[in-house]
Every structure is written in structure tokens, then in C-alpha cells.
Interface confidence: low
Amino acid sequence: QDVSCPLGSFPCGNMSRCLPQLLHCNGVDDCGNRADEDHCGDNNGWSLQLDKYFANYYKLASTNSFEAETSECLVGSVPMHCLCRDLELDCDEANLRAVPSVSSNVTVMSLQRNFIRTLPPNGFRKYHELQKLCLQNNRIHSVSVSAFRGLRSLTKLYLSHNRITFLKPGVFEDLHRLEWLIIEDNHLSRISPLTFYGLNSLILLVLMNNALTRLPDKPLCQHMPRLHWLDFEGNRIHNLRNLTFISCNNLTVLVMRKNKINYLNEHAFTHLQKLDELDLGSNKIENLPPNIFKDLKELSQLNISYNPIQKIEVNQFDCLAKLKSLSLEGIEISNIQQRMFRPLINLSHIYFKKFQYCGYAPHVRSCKPNTDGISSLENLLASIIQR
């Protein structure tokens, strides 16, 4: 049966022993059966979602794979320095200046770390069976609007670590089956909903470390109805407007960390009713509109750490009943009180600027930091008991 512990203490698994919050998830086996160090990983949100997705993906992939796999090359003659196995072409670091020409039945083409500067019109058109295209770490600066025409079977496109500054509306028009689009570390300075025209099946869009200063004040997901994960980490976005995410009904994860956001429209997240993880860490947010999180009924992970937030309303988190992890690191909460966190009945992890704040969330098993960096464990325990 479940052990009942006083507020601020948590059970040692099925032992009838309770330990204070401080001794749980501190890296030491204080219970004697390691129960206080079990289930300490904060594996909510993004990572859990990815795990779930990968599990499904590999299940599907394994059922579709060839009965008897062969290592023979089935894409005809291949360029020097390229490797080939079955219908997969590996031309990584092959000193290529352009997309190679091989048999049209190729299913995987990896062209990483070459010297491809432009993607010309119809450069991949004949590869109608291509499922995965890797173009990371080239010198691509120009992408023709018809570069990806004909790639009807493509499910994964990697364009990271290039020099792309602009993607024309319609460049992805034919990619109706694309599920992953990764454009990390490029020089994109703007996007519009029409940039993503045709991406009916897109699930994951990663635009980390580009030069975006603003998001369109138009429905960004208009042409990406199945989008689950959207990552804008490391851009220069200044504000979040009310229309941007209006069509992102299926969004599960939104990562906006390490931007320059200083303004949040009160309705910025209103339509994100399936959102599981929201990361706004390391921005310039000073004010949180009172109702900013009110529609995020499914949210399990929220990070607003390292923002110059002046004040957190007492009822700021009241609607987040499913929240499991809350990151408030680097935030001075001058008006902190237990009332702020009490409605968060499912909260298992909380992260503060100061150890002393943990006393205001006594029902949360894992609270960091779990020392003040000075006092001994005995002194800390004594002060908790006194309190």
C-alpha cells in the first residue's frame, strides 16, 4: 500500500519510511534501497515525446524492411569516394561540387561535408523514391524554388550547417510526405507560412541557430497541419504575436529558448491545446501576461528560466494541473509563496535560483538546487525541521 508522508517528505518506495525533499534526488542513497534516487530523471516533455515517436518509427520501419537484406549496390555506378549499399548512397566527404547522378531508384542519399554551393532547379527531380536526403555541412547559399521538385517519397531532409539565407515560398511544395525538416545553423532571416507550403505530413521542424528576428504575424502552421515539434532555439526573435501559432493545433513541443523575446502577447499560446513542452528559457521576458498559460491544459514541462522576470503572479500557474516539470532558474521571485505552486498537483521536478525557494514547494519531490552551496547537510536539515 502507499506510504503516507507529511508535507515536505516523500516515501522510500514501499518502505514505511519518509525522507525530506532535500534528501531525494541528491545523488546519495539515503533510503538504503535507492528508492530516493529512483525516478529522478526529468524525462517529461521533449525527450519523452521523441522516445515515443522513435519507438513507433522503428516499429514501422522494421515491419517494412527487406526480408533478406543485401549489401550489393543497386543504384548503378557511383562517384569516386562514395559508398553504396542496396539502394543507399553515402557520399559524405567525397569532394563533391554538385549533386551526383545515380540511378533513380536510390532511397537514401547522404552528401554531408562536401562543397555543394547551390541547389539548382530540378536537381533531385528524378529521385522519386528518395526517402532520406542529407545535405549537412556543405556551403549551400542558394536553393532554387524548384530544387526539391519531384521528391514525392522524401520523409527526412537535413539542411543543417549551411549558408542558406532565404527559402522561397513553395520550395518544399512537392514534399507531401516529409516528416522531418532540419535546418539548423544556417542564415535564415525570415520565414512565412508559405515557406512551408506543401508540407502536409511534417512532424518535426528544427530551425535552431538561424538569424530569425521575428516570426510572421500570420498562421505559421497553415500548411503544416500535423506539426508536433517546432524548435526555434538560438535565433534573435523579439516577440511572440497572437496569430503566429493560431493554426498549430497539434503542436506538442515548442522550443523558443535563447532568443531575444521581450514581449509575449497574452494570446500567443491560446491555440496550443495539445502542447506538452514549452521552453522560453534564456530570453528577455520581463512581464508574463496573467493568462499567458491558461489554455495549456496538457502542458507537462515549462521552462521560463533565465529571464529578467520582475514578478510572477500568485495564480500564474493555476491552470497547469498536468505540469510535471517547472524551471524557474535564475529568477528572483520576490513575492514567492506556497500558493503559487500548490495547484501544480502533478509537479515532480522544480528548479529555482535559490535553495531557499524549495521550502515553498514542499509537495514536489525533486527540487533543485538542493543545497545552498555553503551549509552542511545537517544544518540544512535542521533549518528545514525548524521551519
Partner: antibody
Framework: QVQLQQSGAELVRPGVSVKLSCKAS????????MNWVKQRPGQGLEWIGM????????VINQKFKDKATLTVDKSSSTAYMQLSSPTSEDSAVYYC???????????WGQGTTLTVSS | DVLMTQTPLSLPVSLGDQASISCRSS???????????LEWYLQKPGQSPNLLIY???NRFSGVPDRFSGSGSGTDFTLKISRVEAEDLGVYYC?????????FGSGTKLEIK
């Protein structure tokens, strides 16, 4: 608001190249294709070609491939069409038109009348 | 090239009447992405053309609901339910599915 302002009427001698301009305002020139359309007096409309200002990619109607050259100057948000060796057949009103990605011309210039005459 | 044939060339109507213009393409104008990029434009005397209908049946913003488009494959129709004086001019169909893009020859809507 979006506007396409075309250059004024031109009278040129046969064989002397002419360059028509279309200045875009109210939107970012580099985001949309710019098209050019010909209309001879009392006749219908004829599509010449289009250019994407972000990288100057052009798509030209083969009928005009030796006649029209499309260019852009991003710094002045202006698209140009140069007509080489004009003849009386080239006398017409020429329109520039913005092509929305839903494949329609949503904004048009007011037109430039070109008269080729000796 | 895709030939767009419009009928009639001239359409005399009385104000308040219904008008119907037909446009036939010489081959299917379904784009490889599944959309049919068939548009209707109206050019009033001395003016640039204006978009009325795109993708066969979608009214462009600000276009009155008396204008409607229909059709598929190679046969398309523009209907004006009650003609008003401001509707007079030349109507062009246009296909933007296959390069080179092509216009119909035009239908002149005039008062009877």
C-alpha cells in the same frame, strides 16, 4: 499597401533596346515571383516570363527567350525587363504583376506603353 | 503550350441578368501537386487586369459573391449571377499550372 509602379510610356526606334522598370513597395520584393505580361493594342494578354528576385532565377516563355531579359535590383526593390531589337510587333502595353504562391497575380502595375516606330 | 479557348468572344447582357463564360483548355491543367491553377481576371477599359477567381472556384478577397467559378480537368465556367454596370469589361481565363502560362483570348461583357 502593396504597389507596383511602372515606368512611363516609351517611344523607341526599331532595333534600339529598351528597358522597362517596375518598382515594388509595401512588401519585400524578394519574397514573390515578378511576372511580365504583354498586351498588344486591342488584343489579349500574353505571359512573357517571371523572375524570383531572391536569386534571380527566371522562367521564360520560349517565345520570348531571345526578346526579353528579366533582371532585378534588390537594393531599389525594382524589377526590369529589357527588350532587345524591338520591332513594331513589340509595340504593346507591358504589365508587371506579382505572383502569389497560390499561383495567381494578385497585384498588377499600371502598365507601360511601348511604341516602336521610326 | 496549353491553349485556352474562351467562348463567347462577346457577351451582350442586360443589367441584372445572369452571365456565363466558358473556358476550355487543350489539355488537363491539374498541376503535379493536385491543384488546378485556373484563374479569372477582369480588365476594365484603360485599366490593368484584376483577379476575380483563383484555383477554379475561390473568390479573391473583395470580390462580390455574385461571381462564382466552377469546372475541372479541361472545362471551366465563370458565372455572374446578376450583372451590374461595374462588371463590364473583358474577362480572361488563365492557367498557371504549366509553363508557359497562358491566357484565354478574352470575352467582352457589354450592355445589350
Amino acid at each position: 499597401q502593396v504597389q507596383l509602379q511602372q515606368s512611363g510610356a516609351e517611344l523607341v526606334r526599331p532595333g534600339v533596346s529598351v528597358k522597362l522598370s517596375c518598382k515594388a513597395s509595401g512588401y519585400s520584393l524578394t519574397t514573390y515571383w515578378m511576372n511580365w505580361v504583354k498586351q498588344r493594342p486591342g488584343q489579349g494578354l500574353e505571359w512573357i516570363g517571371m523572375i524570383h528576385p531572391s536569386d534571380s532565377e527566371t522562367v521564360i516563355n520560349q517565345k520570348f527567350k531571345d526578346k526579353a531579359t528579366l533582371t532585378v535590383d534588390k537594393s531599389s526593390s525594382t524589377a526590369y525587363m529589357q527588350l532587345s531589337s524591338p520591332t513594331s510587333e513589340d509595340s504593346a502595353v507591358y504589365y508587371c504583376a506579382r505572383w502569389d504562391y497560390d499561383y495567381y497575380f494578385d497585384y498588377w502595375g499600371q502598365g507601360t506603353t511601348l511604341t516602336v516606330s521610326s | 503550350d496549353v491553349l485556352m479557348t474562351q467562348t463567347p468572344l462577346s457577351l451582350p447582357v442586360s443589367l441584372g441578368d445572369q452571365a456565363s463564360i466558358s473556358c476550355r483548355s487543350s489539355q488537363s491543367i491539374v498541376h503535379s501537386n493536385g491543384n488546378t491553377y485556373l484563374e479569372w481576371y477582369l480588365q476594365k477599359p484603360g485599366q490593368s487586369p484584376n483577379l476575380l477567381i483563383y484555383k477554379v472556384s475561390n473568390r479573391f478577397s473583395g470580390v462580390p459573391d455574385r461571381f462564382s467559378g466552377s469546372g475541372s480537368g479541361t472545362d471551366f465556367t465563370l458565372k455572374i449571377s446578376r450583372v451590374e454596370a461595374e462588371d463590364l469589361g473583358v474577362y480572361y481565363c488563365f492557367q498557371g499550372s504549366h509553363v508557359p502560362f497562358t491566357f484565354g483570348s478574352g470575352t467582352k461583357l457589354e450592355i445589350k
